[in-house]
């Protein structure tokens, strides 16, 4: 059974079917003989009792007050009274946006992480038996989906999925056609979970160099925002005035991670720079990854297989 209307403040859009269901419904069935009344008060009017004669748009069923449809002048306070039980709601009916398929103030926002499961199901359990068909729109363009009773989207989210999704239920009542719109503003955000950072390219790199020339050792990693990338070389970093660690450069990936690069520039290469390890490390809370570079004199290249040289 449809749950009762427990929210004390409700905003609805003019022109749509709407209902209020009080929260002592099971109790009301037990005491059928008890007098049950619905009242409305708005502005100057105090507690006017509602019944089908009040308006052709109003219907009363057991626990429910129905509007076919709700209109701007239905704004006000509503009361259900039964013996010593009273429930009150404040109803605000807002104007429909005539230039869009939905009204901005009646939108439910949802945030979905990219690549995570994303689902929209068009359901309306209260009016289910009256619904002829249901359509799903994205940014007010109809989506062609197989099921026209309960259209559904089930997929892994992509950034292209971001947008306003409107479920529009079409239903008949007393020979008139009505529709009910439920809109979701779907925002796709980057994956918030951390990755294990990884250095890009081969783990061991032999770099062919000439004495007296300069070389740039490129180190790049895919990492999280808080991870660090750094160079380690020699007994004590910074002891060689010809070695310069350039500023780190970061680029955000579409998944919300970062491509970080750090270049080690070695100027006026000397014998002391040859055949020693220059290590680039990426560190995170989850551990570290290291890749190594060894400078080799071009004349000695023949001794090393070609596939181990970097570009």
């Amino acid at each position: 059974a449809e749950s009762c209307t427990s929210r004390p403040h409700i905003t609805v859009v003019e022109g749509e079917p709407f209902y209020l269901k009080h929260c002592s419904c099971s109790l009301a069935h037990e005491i059928e003989t008890t007098t049950k009344s619905w009242y409305k008060s708005s502005g100057s009017q105090e507690h006017v009792e509602l019944n089908p004669r009040s308006s052709s748009r109003i219907a009363l069923h057991d626990c429910v007050l129905e509007f076919w449809p709700v209109e701007l002048n239905d704004t006000g306070s509503y009361f259900f009274q039964m013996k010593n039980y009273t429930q009150k709601w404040k109803l605000n009916v807002i104007r429909r946006n005539k230039h869009s398929c939905f009204t901005e103030r009646q939108v439910t926002s949802k945030i979905v992480e990219v690549k995570k499961f994303f689902q929209i199901t068009c359901e309306n359990s209260y009016y289910q038996t009256l619904v002829n068909s249901t359509s799903l729109y994205k940014n007010c363009k109809k989506l062609l989906l197989e099921n026209n009773k309960n259209p559904t989207i089930k997929k892994n989210a992509e950034f292209e999925d971001q947008g306003y999704y409107s479920c529009v239920h079409f239903l008949h009542h007393n020979g008139k056609l009505f529709n009910i719109t439920k809109t979701f503003n779907i925002t796709i955000v980057e994956d918030r979970s951390n990755i294990v950072p990884v250095l890009l390219g081969p783990k061991l790199n032999h770099v062919a160099v000439e004495l007296g020339k300069n070389v740039r050792l490129n180190c790049s990693a895919l990492l999280n925002e808080e991870d660090v990338i750094y160079w380690m070389f020699g007994e004590e970093n910074g002891s060689d005035p010809n070695i310069h660690e350039e500023k780190e450069m970061r680029i955000m990936t579409p998944e919300g991670k970062w491509h970080a690069s750090k270049v080690l520039r070695i100027e006026n290469i000397g014998e002391s720079n040859l055949n020693v390890l220059y290590n680039c490390t990426v560190a995170s809370t989850g551990g570290t990854d290291t890749k190594s570079f060894i400078l080799v004199r071009k004349a000695d290249m023949a001794d090393i297989p070609g596939h181990v040289f970097t570009r």
Epitope: E225, I251, M252, T253, G256, V263
Partner: antibody, heavy 119, light 107 residues
Framework: QVQLQQSGPGLVKPSQTLSLTCAIS??????????WNWIRQSPSRGLEWLGR?????????DYAVSVKSRITINPDTSKNQFSLQLNSVTPEDTAVYYC?????????WGQGTMVTVSS | EIVLTQSPATLSLSPGERATLSCRAS??????LAWYQQKPGQAPRLLIY???NRATGIPARFSGSGSGTDFTLTISSLEPEDFAVYYC?????????FGGGTKVEIK
């Protein structure tokens, strides 16, 4: 100092392909210290990032969702340049197109190419 | 995507006055925010990156501050050549986006 020089036609017919090239001087398209972007500007859309290419042990390309199905950005290491191709253009694609280096931010901009889509 | 809202749309000031431009992000971009200056018929020029760092060759009268969602570009004393349109841009969320701009005009 780094400079970007753009070239390509200023008039493209609807449904055809917009093609622009950006020649890099003072830097390398395969540097680890930058990415190479295309950004466009129109009165209706303002400044809009379209996509980029960059090298980090391999080539990466990222594109804006709005043009993802129509765009290709290619590096050319032999000529030290990169190009933009935008397929199936409509009058909505009329804009000034810029090629831009991304270092600390979008730090070096080409001179811009006004592209009009019209029959 | 992140929406960057710049205010005011237009700022009318005289040379020598202080200009304060605001940029607000729809969600946090950490400190990954840049400011650009654009003059008619020219490409934008980078002024400030990562919220508060001046780009190479930018005069000290330009300064940036802020983090998270609220950022400010301050021009301490306007020079005649500073009258232009200023844009903010974020790279702390995917995809990179720009604000709509603030025009600083001569009063």
């Amino acid at each position: 100092q780094v400079q970007l020089q753009q070239s390509g036609p200023g008039l493209v017919k609807p449904s055809q392909t917009l093609s622009l090239t950006c020649a890099i001087s003072g830097d390398s398209v395969s540097t680890y210290s930058a990415a190479w972007n295309w950004i466009r500007q129109s009165p209706s859309r303002g400044l809009e990032w379209l996509g980029r290419t960059y090298y980090r042990s391999e080539w990466y390309n990222d594109y804006a969702v709005s043009v993802k199905s129509r765009i290709t950005i290619n590096p050319d290491t032999s000529k030290n340049q990169f190009s933009l191709q935008l397929n199936s253009v409509t009058p909505e694609d009329t804009a000034v197109y810029y090629c831009v280096r991304e270092g600390d931010a979008f730090d070096i901009w080409g001179q811009g190419t006004m592209v009009t889509v019209s029959s | 995507e992140i929406v960057l809202t710049q205010s005011p749309a237009t700022l009318s000031l005289s040379p020598g006055e202080r200009a304060t431009l605001s940029c607000r992000a729809s969600q946090s971009v950490s400190s990954y925010l840049a400011w650009y200056q654009q003059k008619p018929g020219q490409a934008p020029r980078l002024l400030i990156y990562d919220a508060s760092n001046r780009a190479t060759g930018i005069p000290a009268r330009f300064s940036g501050s802020g983090s998270g969602t609220d950022f400010t570009l301050t021009i301490s004393s306007l020079e005649p050549e500073d009258f232009a349109v200023y844009y903010c841009q974020q790279r702390g969320n995917w995809p990179p986006t720009f604000g709509g701009g603030t025009k600083v005009e001569i009063k």
